[in-house]
C-alpha cells in the first residue's frame, strides 16, 4: 500500500530508537570517514523531520523518497570533497543514480584504526553517563568498518552490548564479568559480517536469482516440512530484505524484516515445529533466533529424490514448461533431504543437474542420458568431504594458531603476490573455522565449514579487487559464488612467482613485541611466516617448522631476559643467519 | 503451457505413406530433442523415433528402421514423421512428447493401416 509520506511510515512502523538507530547506520555505512558527532548530528535532524512528517504527512518535502531525503542530507555535509574525494561526484546526480554511486563507494577496507575496546571501568563509566550515546558510538564504529553489515542485526547486536554491559557494570570485578562476553558478541558479529558481506556480493554480482536459488537450499534445509510454495514465498520474501539493505535500504530492509519474522510466527504450522521458542522473544531476539533457528526434523516417508527427477518420463517436458520452478523443485527436494550438505555444494549439484538437462534434453534419447546423473553428483559431493576430514584432522593435531599457520604457508604458496596483512587476515579467519566447526557434529560439519570459508574467501576476492595482483585470486574469484571455494583449494604452488630478495629488517624484531596482547605477538610471527613464504615459495614444511620453532624460542628468551634490548640486538641478527641457513 | 498437436493421420493401405505433423508452443522448441511414440489398441505406449535438438541426430525402433524418418523444422516449430511402406501393424494412435517422454500428451492422430 502506497503511503503519502515514506519517512512517516517507517518512522511510526519502527518506533524512534529503532529508526534513529538504522539512520546512524545507514549514514556510518555510506560516509565512513565522518566523526559520530557529525553523524549524530545529521541523525536527529532526519529525526526531527521524520516527526514533523508523522505529525502532518502533506507538510513541505515529506512526501519525497528517502534516498532524496538521506542523499541530500549527506551532499549538504561541508568539505565533502576534502574528506571524500570523488565520492562528492555522487552528489552531481540524480536519484536512483545517486544512491547507485554512493553504494559503488561504500569502501570494505576503510583506513580506519582497529576498534579499540576501552578498559572495564572507564567502559562502565560512560556507559552509565549516557547509555544512548554509548550505543550510537557502537553502531557507528562497527557500521563504518563493516558497510555491508546486516543493519537490524547490527541493532541485536547493540541491544546485546546494552544488556552485557548492564549486567557486568554492576559487578565487582567488572573486567572478568565484561571481556569473555564481549569477545563472545564480536567474534558473533564478526561472522555476522562476512556472511552478509557474501550475500550481497551474490546480489550485486549474480542478481537476485542467485540469491534466491541460495535462501531456497537453505529454507529447505531448516524447514524441510514446509511445502515449496511456502518455501518459495519465504526466499522471495529473504530476497527482498537482503536486496533492500545491501541497497541501503535500511528502514524498508529492518521494517521488511519484521514482517517477514510476524509471517512466519503466525505460520508456524505451515513452515517448522521448531519456531515457538523463538516467537516467544521480543522483536530483534525474535528475528536474530529465527535466522539460526535448529532444523526441523526431517519427514520420515520423502521418496527417493530419483523418482521425480531421473525416472519420471516428463522430465524434459516439466524442464521445458517452466525451467525455473522444476530446477527449484529440484533444489528444494535435494536440500531438505541433505542438511548435512552446505548450501554451496547444494547450489553446484543443481548446476550440475541443470547442465545435464540442458545438455540431455536436447538429445534423440535424453533419459538414456541424464539416467546416470544422480551418480554424476558423487565426486561432488565427496571433494567436500575430504576437504572437511583433511582440515578437521590437521586442526586436531595443531590447534588453532598452528593450523591457522598452515593455511598461511598454503595460501601464501597459491598467491604469493597478495600483500601479507591481507594473507594473514585470511589465513586467521580461514584458520577459526576449526574452533567453529570442526568440534560440531559429523553431520554439521560440512554445510559449517564449506559455508564459513566460502564466506571469508568472498572477502579475499573483495579485497583483491581494489588492487589485482595474482592471476590465480582473479581467476577464482572471477567465476560463479559457489565454485570460488574449490577453486582456491585446488590453487597449487604459484610457479610464475619469483621470489622475494631475502631483507633481514623484515624479520628483524625489538623488545616492544613482548608486552604486546597474546594476539597481535601472533599476528607480528604469522608476518614473518608469510614473508618467509614469499623469499622460498618451495620450503618444505619441515625447513619452515624449524625456523618458526627457532622463531618462537628466540621470542621466549629475549622476553624473559633482564636486558631485553641487548638481548634482541644481538641474538636478532643470529636468529636472521640461522634462518637465512635453514631455508638455504 | 507446453502444448503439442499432432496432425496427418488417417486410413491408408498396406505400402502406402503419411506424414504426420506436430506443432509446438509454450516452450524453446529448438533446445528439446523430440519423439513419436505410439499406442496401438490395447496395448501400451511403444516409443517409435527420436530426434536431437538440432536435427543432427536421429534414432528409430527396430520394427520402423528403414521405412520413417523423423525430422523437424525448427523455425516452424514443427516435427515430422514420414512414414513409407506402412504395415498393418502401425496401426496406432501417434503422439509426440517432449524429451523421450513415454507419456502422451496432445489428443494424438490416427493411423490405420488396412485393405
Known amino acids: 500500500e502506497a503511503h503519502k509520506s515514506e519517512i512517516a511510515h517507517r518512522y511510526n512502523d519502527l518506533g524512534e530508537q529503532h529508526f534513529k538507530g538504522l539512520v546512524l547506520i545507514a549514514f556510518s555505512q555510506y560516509l565512513q570517514k565522518c566523526s559520530y558527532d557529525e553523524h549524530a548530528k545529521l541523525v536527529q535532524e532526519v529525526t526531527d523531520f521524520a516527526k514533523t512528517c508523522v505529525a502532518d504527512e502533506s507538510a513541505a518535502n515529506c512526501d519525497k523518497s528517502l534516498h532524496t531525503l538521506f542523499g541530500d542530507k549527506l551532499c549538504a555535509i561541508p568539505n565533502l570533497r576534502e574528506n571524500y574525494g570523488e565520492l562528492a561526484d555522487c552528489c552531481t546526480k540524480q536519484e536512483p543514480e545517486r544512491n547507485e554511486c554512493f553504494l559503488q563507494h561504500k569502501d570494505d577496507n576503510p583506513s580506519l584504526p582497529p576498534f579499540e575496546r576501552p578498559e572495564a571501568e572507564a567502559m562502565c563509566t560512560s556507559f552509565k553517563e549516557n547509555p544512548t550515546t554509548f550505543m550510537g558510538h557502537y553502531l557507528h564504529e562497527v557500521a563504518r568498518r563493516h558497510p555491508y553489515f546486516y543493519a537490524p542485526e547490527l541493532l541485536y547486536y547493540a541491544e546485546q552490548y546494552n544488556e552485557i554491559l548492564t549486567q557486568c557494570c554492576a559487578e565487582a570485578d567488572k573486567e572478568s564479568c565484561l571481556t569473555p562476553k564481549l569477545d563472545g558478541v564480536k567474534e558473533k558479529a564478526l561472522v555476522s559480517s562476512v556472511r552478509q558481506r557474501m550475500k550481497c556480493s551474490s546480489m550485486q554480482k549474480f542478481g537476485e536469482r542467485a540469491f534466491k536459488a541460495w535462501a531456497v537450499a537453505r529454507l529447505s534445509q531448516t524447514f524441510p516440512n514446509a511445502d515449496f510454495a511456502e518455501i518459495t514465498k519465504l526466499a522471495t520474501d529473504l530476497t527482498k530484505v537482503n536486496k533492500e539493505c545491501c541497497h541501503g535500504d535500511l528502514l524498508e530492509c529492518a521494517d521488511d524484516r519484521a514482517e517477514l519474522a510476524k509471517y512466519m510466527c503466525e505460520n508456524q504450522a505451515t513452515i517448522s515445529s521448531k519456531l515457538q521458542t523463538c516467537c516467544d522473544k521480543p522483536l530483534l531476539k525474535k528475528a536474530h533466533c529465527l535466522s539460526e533457528v535448529e532444523h526441523d526434523t526431517m519427514p520420515a516417508d520423502l521418496p527417493a529424490i530419483a523418482a521425480d527427477f531421473v525416472e519420471d518420463q516428463e522430465v524434459c517436458k516439466n524442464y521445458a514448461e517452466a525451467k525455473d520452478v522444476f530446477l527449484g523443485t529440484f533444489l528444494y527436494e535435494y536440500s531438505r533431504r541433505h542438511p548435512d550438505y552446505s548450501v554451496s555444494l547444494l547450489l553446484r549439484l543443481a548446476k550440475k543437474y541443470e547442465a545435464t538437462l540442458e545438455k540431455c534434453c536436447a538429445e534423440a534419447n535424453p533419459p538414456a542420458c541424464y539416467g546416470t546423473v544422480l551418480a554424476e553428483f558423487q565426486p561432488l559431493v565427496e571433494e567436500p568431504k575430504n576437504l572437511v576430514k583433511t582440515n578437521c584432522d590437521l586442526y586436531e593435531k595443531l590447534g588453532e594458531y598452528g593450523f591457522q599457520n598452515a593455511i598461511l604457508v598454503r595460501y601464501t604458496q597459491k598467491a604469493p603476490q597478495v600483500s601479507t596483512p591481507t594473507l594473514v587476515e585470511a589465513a586467521r579467519n580461514l584458520g577459526r573455522v576449526g574452533t567453529k566447526c570442526c568440534t560440531l557434529p559429523e553431520d554439521q560439519r560440512l554445510p559449517c565449514v564449506e559455508d564459513y570459508l566460502s564466506a571469508i574467501l568472498n572477502r579475499v576476492c573483495l579485497l583483491h579487487e581494489k588492487t589485482p595482483v595474482s592471476e590465480h585470486v582473479t581467476k577464482c574469484c572471477s567465476g560463479s559464488l559457489v565454485e570460488r571455494r574449490p577453486c582456491f583449494s585446488a590453487l597449487t604452488v604459484d610457479e610464475t612467482y619469483v621470489p622475494k630478495e631475502f631483507k633481514a629488517e623484515t624479520f628483524t624484531f625489538h623488545s616492544d613485541i613482548c608486552t604486546l596482547p597474546e594476539k597481535e605477538k601472533q599476528i607480528k610471527k604469522q608476518t614473518a611466516l608469510a614473508e618467509l613464504v614469499k623469499h622460498k615459495p618451495k620450503a618444505t614444511a619441515e625447513q619452515l617448522k624449524t625456523v618458526m620453532d627457532d622463531f618462537a624460542q628466540f621470542l621466549d628468551t629475549c622476553c624473559k631476559a633482564a636486558d631485553k634490548d641487548t638481548c634482541f640486538s644481538t641474538e636478532g641478527p643470529n636468529l636472521v643467519t640461522r634462518c637465512k641457513d635453514a631455508l638455504a | 503451457q507446453v502444448q503439442l498437436q499432432e496432425s496427418g493421420g488417417g486410413l491408408v493401405q498396406p505400402g502406402g505413406s503419411l506424414r504426420l505433423s506436430c506443432e509446438a508452443s509454450?516452450?524453446?522448441?529448438?533446445?528439446?530433442?523430440m519423439t513419436w511414440v505410439r499406442q496401438a489398441p490395447g496395448k501400451g505406449v511403444e516409443w517409435v523415433s527420436g530426434?536431437?535438438?538440432?536435427?543432427?541426430?536421429?534414432l528409430y525402433a527396430d520394427s520402423v528402421k528403414g521405412r520413417f524418418t523423423i525430422s523437424r523444422d525448427n523455425a516452424k516449430n514443427t516435427l515430422y514423421l514420414q512414414m513409407n511402406s506402412l504395415k498393418p501393424e502401425d496401426t496406432a494412435v501417434y503422439y509426440c512428447?517432449?524429451?523421450?517422454?513415454?507419456?502422451?500428451g496432445g489428443q494424438g492422430t490416427q493411423v490405420t493401416v488396412s485393405s
Open positions: 512428447t517432449i524429451g523421450g517422454s513415454l507419456n502422451p
Open positions: 509454450g516452450f524453446t522448441f529448438s533446445r528439446f530433442g
Open positions: 530426434i536431437s535438438s538440432l536435427g543432427d541426430s536421429t
